[in-house]
């Protein structure tokens, strides 16, 4: 009686289990009851990630430099490229199709978490006692300036924007 | 045992279509593979295309837009049709039995003796 | 397409001799899944149609004599007869049969010194 399910590693065809191809592989024939099923490496811009049946590999992803992208990792006959961004930038999706300039922290907020290739500026607010007065993608909260340790006081407080501004204490 | 025998014209036309046929004995097109490779005179080896056991076929690039390969396996023939033929296309034209040895491996392992095809008008 | 390129074009060698053809490509023929190369020999005498050596670049054809054997891996490899006969005296091909277009080297012609 023909099979109606096949092992793993096998596909069902006419009524037959078959080998399917490695990764790294195409189909070129399938197996019949006297022969097993042809395979054919994919060619360098190609590959297949998995046991499969397919007649055609697919092409590598194209790090397009006019999209900001890089080659991270170069593709094989089993894996695809990886693409990730220039300098400065980062990808717009998981799948790292386009780039976008990292986001810079505005006055108020530093950087929790500078940005990679992959992943945006992370910014925090200032909390009481730190300020940021610039729009930058690389600083962090800084901490108001300390009067008391130069042996001035407050004259003006301290914003999450702006740093404390000392003076000399009144004498009397 | 298996043989392999090419025929067709062996004077071809400039522009006209260029017509072969391999036939073979010994094996079946349905369980092996045919190659077509060319080899003009005093020069290299020159794959031209494939006919799978299923029945698809792969051309070179540098011929494609001007090659067909097809089979009749009940007459146990392929046949190669090359387009718009040139004095560059002169060559011996062999056809050669594909073997398949797992793992995506294949080579040619019986080939016909060849037959001269001159192009000119 | 892969570009097969031989050396020397043309070798002489002495009888009993061990002969050494080499082919480069122009792309790694090692398949990184099942580690083999995908790379023929043949072996073509004047007049007649080439011969399958070798392929998976050292698995010899049945019927070939063992001293003909292959190696290399990646973009290089070399094909060698330990010991030179007379019948050896042929025009030898590398083919790659990784994918295709499959594509030859141009040719080596082996002749007795």
């Known amino acids: 009686e023909p099979p109606t399910a096949c092992r793993e590693k096998q596909y069902l065809i006419n009524s037959q289990c078959c080998s399917l191809c490695q990764p790294g592989q195409k189909l070129v024939s399938d197996c019949t009851e006297f022969t097993e099923t042809e395979c054919l490496p994919c060619s360098e811009s190609e590959f297949l990630d998995t046991w499969n049946r397919e007649t055609r590999c697919h092409q590598h992803k194209y790090c397009d430099p006019n999209l900001g992208l890089q080659v991270q990792q170069k593709g094989t006959s089993e894996t695809d490229t990886i693409c990730t961004c220039e300098e400065g930038l980062h990808c717009t999706s998981e799948s790292c199709e386009s780039c976008v300039p990292h986001r810079s922290c505005l006055p108020g907020f530093g950087v929790k978490q500078i940005a990679t290739g992959v992943s945006d500026t992370i910014c925090e607010p200032c909390p009481v006692g730190f300020f940021s007065n610039v729009s930058s993608a690389f600083e962090k909260c800084r901490p108001w300036t300390s009067c008391e340790t130069k042996d001035l006081v407050v004259q003006q407080a301290g914003t999450n924007k702006t740093d404390v501004v000392c003076g000399p204490q009144d004498r009397q | 045992q298996v043989q392999l025998q090419e025929s067709g014209p062996g004077l071809v036309k400039p522009s006209e279509t260029l017509s072969l046929t391999c036939t073979v004995s010994?094996?079946?097109?349905?369980?092996?593979?045919l190659h077509w490779i060319r080899q003009p005179p005093g020069k290299g080896l020159e794959w031209i295309g494939v006919i799978w056991r299923g029945g698809n076929t792969d051309y070179n690039p540098s011929l494609k837009s001007r090659v067909t390969i097809s089979k009749d396996t009940s007459k146990n023939q392929v046949s190669l049709k090359l387009s718009s033929v040139t004095a560059a296309d002169t060559a011996v034209y062999y056809c050669?039995?594909?073997?398949?040895?797992?793992?995506?491996?294949?080579?040619?392992?019986?080939w016909g003796q060849g037959t001269l095809v001159t192009v000119s008008s | 397409d892969i570009v097969m390129t031989q050396s020397p074009d043309s070798l002489a060698v002495s009888l009993g001799e061990r002969a050494t053809i080499n082919c480069k490509s122009s792309q790694s023929l090692l398949h990184s899944f099942n580690q083999k190369n995908y790379l023929a020999w043949y072996q073509q005498k004047p007049g007649q149609p080439p011969k399958l050596l070798i392929y998976?670049?050292?698995t010899r054809e049945s019927g070939v004599p063992d001293r003909f054997s292959g190696s290399g891996s990646g973009t290089d490899f070399t094909l060698t007869i330990s010991s030179l006969q007379a019948e050896d005296v042929a025009v030898y091909y590398c083919?790659?049969?990784?994918?295709?277009?499959?594509?030859f080297g141009q040719g080596t012609k082996l002749e007795i010194k």
């Open positions: 998976f670049t050292s």
């Open positions: 050669a039995k594909n073997s398949y040895y797992g793992q995506g491996g294949h080579a040619m392992d019986y």
């Open positions: 083919q790659q049969h990784y994918t295709t277009p499959f594509t």
């Open positions: 010994g094996f079946s097109l349905t369980t092996y593979g």
